[in-house]
């Protein structure tokens, strides 16, 4: 019962986590304009992994996709890759874990197979969560670096008279969603791995008992059908093709590759 609960809870937590990772990846608020020096700005900038947006005084928000792929900073590309890998692994993990759930009966699937699948999905969730946490952390580190760099040369005098305030960016909501979601996926994965230990049948070592018949002797050994606990034995190698991980490069080219954070 406890195993089923642990497995079920692990699945639900991972499901929420992966939904969060997907949400964070799609969100536009990875970095938002820092309002410390201009709290009354009528033009508010925020940026995501795929596009940058500007909310104007009219209330209208204009978003433009990063049209270029090669012109984008390598770090942004790395974050995109980490998030997509996290989503793909998480999605496969969810698919595997559905079939691994103890409460779902599929044909005559043995507990050993379910244990294998539970461990596989658990590992996938752990890696997925780590990918998301890593991606968000890399982006956050990039923001912190750029924030202090822009603070250092924040004011550039124009003839000593006019001040031009450089736009600085700070942590957006997507970062917090990503961290929490990555953490949940990681916790869900750990729970699945714990559940896997309970699913794997213990080896029963009964002593052989001999029954002597009057004519000839026949030996019957109980416990002869020993369940396999080797996790590698039942898994087949599947080739995964992900054709969906493409960027939505639309509208217009992004102004400057140095400007996105």
């Amino acid at each position: 019962m406890a195993v089923t609960a642990c497995q079920g809870l692990g699945f639900v937590v991972s499901l929420i986590g992966i939904a969060g990772i997907i949400a964070a990846t799609c969100m536009d608020q990875w970095s938002t304009q820092d309002l410390y020096n201009n709290p009354v700005t009528a033009v508010f900038n925020y940026q995501g992994l795929w596009r940058s947006c500007v909310r104007e005084s009219s209330g209208f928000t204009e978003c433009r996709g990063y049209f270029t792929l090669l012109g984008l900073p390598a770090m942004l590309q790395a974050v995109r890759a980490l998030m997509i890998v996290g989503i793909v692994l998480g999605a496969i993990g969810l698919l595997v874990s559905i079939f691994a759930l103890k409460c779902i009966r599929i044909g005559s699937m043995e507990d050993s197979a379910k244990a294998n699948m539970t461990l596989t999905s658990g590992i996938m969730f752990i890696v997925s969560g780590l990918c998301a946490i890593a991606g968000v952390s890399v982006f956050a580190n990039m923001l912190v670096t750029n924030f202090w760099m822009s603070t250092a040369n924040m004011y550039t005098g124009m003839g000593g008279m006019v001040q031009t305030v450089q736009t600085r960016y700070t942590f957006g909501a997507a970062l917090f969603v990503g961290w929490v979601a990555g953490g949940l996926t990681l916790i869900g994965g750990v729970m699945m791995c714990i559940a896997c230990r309970g699913l794997a049948p213990e080896e029963t070592n009964y002593k052989a008992v001999s029954y002597h018949a009057s004519g000839h002797s026949v030996a019957y050994k109980p416990g002869g059908f020993k369940a396999s606990t080797g996790f590698g034995s039942n898994t087949k190698n599947k080739k995964i093709y992900d054709g969906g991980a493409r960027t939505e490069d639309e509208v217009q080219s992004y102004p400057s590759k140095h400007d996105y954070v």
Epitope: Q33, V40, A42, V43, V54, S58, F60, Q163, T167, P255
Partner: antibody
Framework: QVQLVQSGAEVKKPGASVKVSCKAS????????MHWVRQAPGQRLEWMGY????????SYNQKFQGRVTITVDTSASTAYMELSSLRSEDTAVYYC????????WGQGTTVTVSS | DIQMTQSPSSLSASVGDRVTMTCKSS????????????LTWYQQKPGKAPKLLIY???TRESGVPSRFSGSGSGTDFTLTISSLQPEDFATYYC?????????FGGGTKLEIK
């Protein structure tokens, strides 16, 4: 087409309040903020504040802070601007402004403050 | 608050003339997020509401004749009318659309010579 129709002219005594309405049509009312701008005779245009019809969020010019209140009735696609503690220098034409780039202006409401 | 200063305050010209008026802001109106300058130009005729001519410092509003053009970046902006028409005699205002409170210039009154 997009249109903003404002209420009629008002004559008020100093210390009184005035409430000007602005009925919007031809676009989705909640899509854009509604701004209020006034123009005293022979003076430059002066921004008073705005309201976000989606959530009722407002921002006011500090010059009018505490005296101006902007509200909306989304069901009627109407915005209201109330100015209290009127003084003679509040005599002006009051405009509501909306849509992208603040392109659409109401016809203006003349408010005269006189004892 | 951002101060907007327009010059000249009044200008006399004839039909067919090319006229230029300037607007200076006390702070930059350039937004690095989308590489736009948040300066707007309006035309106002006596007893009428202002009419949007140009936004983003240089983009003409639809329906505005091509003789109107805007230029400039950062803090210095210009509105040019290439060939004055009788209906162009009015007061022109520039507006900061970058920071609250939104502020307007004192206006340039264009009169018939």
């Amino acid at each position: 087409q997009v249109q903003l129709v404002q209420s009629g002219a008002e004559v008020k005594k100093p210390g009184a309040s005035v409430k000007v309405s602005c009925k919007a049509s031809g676009y989705t009312f909640t899509d854009y903020n509604m701004h209020w701008v006034r123009q005293a005779p022979g003076q430059r245009l002066e921004w008073m504040g705005y309201i976000n019809p989606n959530n009722g969020g407002t921002s006011y010019n500090q010059k009018f802070q505490g005296r101006v209140t902007i509200t909306v009735d989304t069901s009627a696609s109407t915005a209201y601007m109330e100015l209290s503690s009127l003084r003679s220098e509040d005599t002006a034409v009051y405009y509501c402004v909306t849509t992208r780039y603040l392109a659409v202006w109401g016809q203006g409401t003349t408010v005269t403050v006189s004892s | 608050d951002i101060q907007m200063t327009q010059s000249p305050s009044s200008l006399s010209a004839s039909v067919g003339d090319r006229v230029t008026m300037t607007c200076k802001s006390s702070q930059s109106l350039f937004n690095s997020g989308n590489q736009k300058n948040y300066l707007t130009w309006y035309q106002q005729k006596p007893g009428k509401a202002p009419k949007l001519l140009i936004y983003w410092a240089s983009t003409r509003e639809s329906g505005v004749p091509s003789r109107f053009s805007g230029s400039g970046s950062g803090t210095d902006f210009t509105l040019t009318i290439s060939s004055l028409q009788p209906e162009d005699f009015a007061t022109y205002y520039c507006q900061n659309d970058y920071s609250y409170p939104l502020t307007f210039g004192g206006g340039t009154k264009l009169e018939i010579k």
